[in-house]
Amino acid sequence: QAGPLPKPTLWAEPGSVISWGNSVTIWCQGTLEAREYRLDKEESPAPWDRQNPLEPKNKARFSIPSMTEDYAGRYRCYYRSPVGWSQPSDPLELVMTGAYSKPTLSALPSPLVTSGKSVTLLCQSRSPMDTFLLIKERAAHPLLHLRSEHGAQQHQAEFPMSPVTSVHGGTYRCFSSHGFSHYLLSHPSDPLELIVSGSLEDPRPSPTRSVSTAAGPEDQPLMPTGSVPHSGLRRHWE
């Protein structure tokens, strides 16, 4: 008796964070024996879509010509071979930006900060929101989620960084969201360039800061120190 069929790989092009109205293609890659591919969306009762494999049969394409709120969510795919259905793929979280107006991102006291000092990035929304995300350009993951404790709506979230090192330098954006759908984000804030000057300490991070030098700092979540912001928001690490 053969073991279970290997699970397929699921990904999105050009990526899994898509602006409203833009096109996105979801790919599911299985094996050369695949007869049919099926895409399931969380909380969708019927199979969300199904497609014949593309030659040479090891993958299928699911096209979304124009991104809307309805497409945002969590997907898994499967393939069917002559011996049955595969295990489900790892989930793909398709996020839509542009659902709400853009927040404002600023740095306190200033976006120009000396190494070893402290800085707080402040993300402010015009309307009350309960989730804020801070993104660093070219980072593999969102740096930080801040989510309100009990669904309380907030106009802002603080992202304290202390002590600052050269790793913290770069271009940041923030997004705001409502808790009822973490897959719907605001337009991105205008970019904020954080410039770290001087060397009050060795700019290379120490291992205690949970930044892997092997992978490179851009591949790791940023781990700012300091107290949890007093805004009633709770920190969630990615």
């Epitope: 007869r35 049919e36 969708s44 009762p45 019927a46 199979p47 879509d49 309805d70 002559p82």
Partner: antibody, heavy 120, light 107 residues
Framework: QVQLQQPGAELVKPGASVKLSCKAS????????MHWVKQRPGQGLEWIGE????????NYNEKFKSKATLTVDKSSSTAYMQLNSLTSEDSAVYYC?????????????WGQGTSVTVSS | DIVMTQTTSSLSASLGDRVTISCRAS??????LNWYQQKPDGTVKLLIY???RLHSGVPSRFSGSGSGTDYSLTISNLEQEDIATYFC?????????FGGGTKLEIK
């Protein structure tokens, strides 16, 4: 019990369009794909396409891509098929059928069919 | 597209007979084969799905078998109400395709 209600007949002129309906009852409409099948007089069955009522996703037989458009109205649990630029070749009985979606990919419940006659 | 062929377009049998209707696919369809009954009034019903599984409410005198490209539907004890046309259909790949049908008549 599962029921798919289709009007009995439609008489249409050549070059015109017709929108056929299929009203579902007895089950959760958005939980099952819906198929449309064509049968010319004295002929076999031809699969036109399928639609997912929960999100409007469709798959078509290449042969019918420029002829048929499948849509749904979730509020009334009704599936529709619009046929455009009708000719005598489109005179046929059109069935809607519910997808079983498990082993076999069968169509487990069928409507009574709508007879479309294209004539001037 | 997968071509489904029912070589026998019509078949005459007596009540009580055992009747077998065959269907061939142009390629392996991995048991994704279904059988339908169409009555003279046009009513279509699913009989068998996935080669051999009986759909709910279908009498046990109907059975299906086969694998790869060759499949068959058997009616073990023909009754008057079985007078109909029988279609096979493959669900292995899109587009779904049907056989041409076998019309069953009483001798």
């Amino acid at each position: 019990q599962v029921q798919l209600q289709q009007p009995g007949a439609e008489l249409v002129k050549p070059g015109a369009s017709v929108k056929l309906s299929c009203k579902a009852s007895g089950y959760t409409f958005t939980s099952y794909w819906m198929h449309w099948v064509k049968q010319r007089p004295g002929q076999g069955l031809e699969w036109i396409g399928e639609i997912n009522p929960s999100n409007g996703r469709t798959n078509y037989n290449e042969k019918f891509k420029s002829k048929a458009t499948l849509t749904v109205d979730k509020s009334s649990s009704t599936a529709y098929m619009q046929l455009n630029s009708l000719t005598s070749e489109d005179s046929a009985v059109y069935y809607c059928a519910r997808d079983r979606y498990d082993e076999g990919n069968a169509m487990d419940y069928w409507g009574q069919g709508t007879s479309v006659t294209v004539s001037s | 597209d997968i071509v489904m062929t029912q070589t026998t377009s019509s078949l005459s049998a007596s009540l009580g007979d055992r009747v077998t209707i065959s269907c061939r696919a142009s390629q392996d369809i991995t048991n994704y084969l279904n059988w339908y009954q169409q009555k003279p009034d046009g009513t279509v019903k699913l009989l068998i799905y996935y080669t051999s599984r009986l759909h709910s409410g279908v009498p046990s005198r109907f059975s299906g078998s086969g694998s790869g490209t060759d499949y068959s539907l058997t009616i073990s004890n023909l009754e008057q109400e079985d007078i109909a046309t029988y279609f096979c259909q493959q669900g292995d790949t899109l587009p779904r395709t049907f056989g041409g049908g076998t019309k069953l008549e009483i001798k």
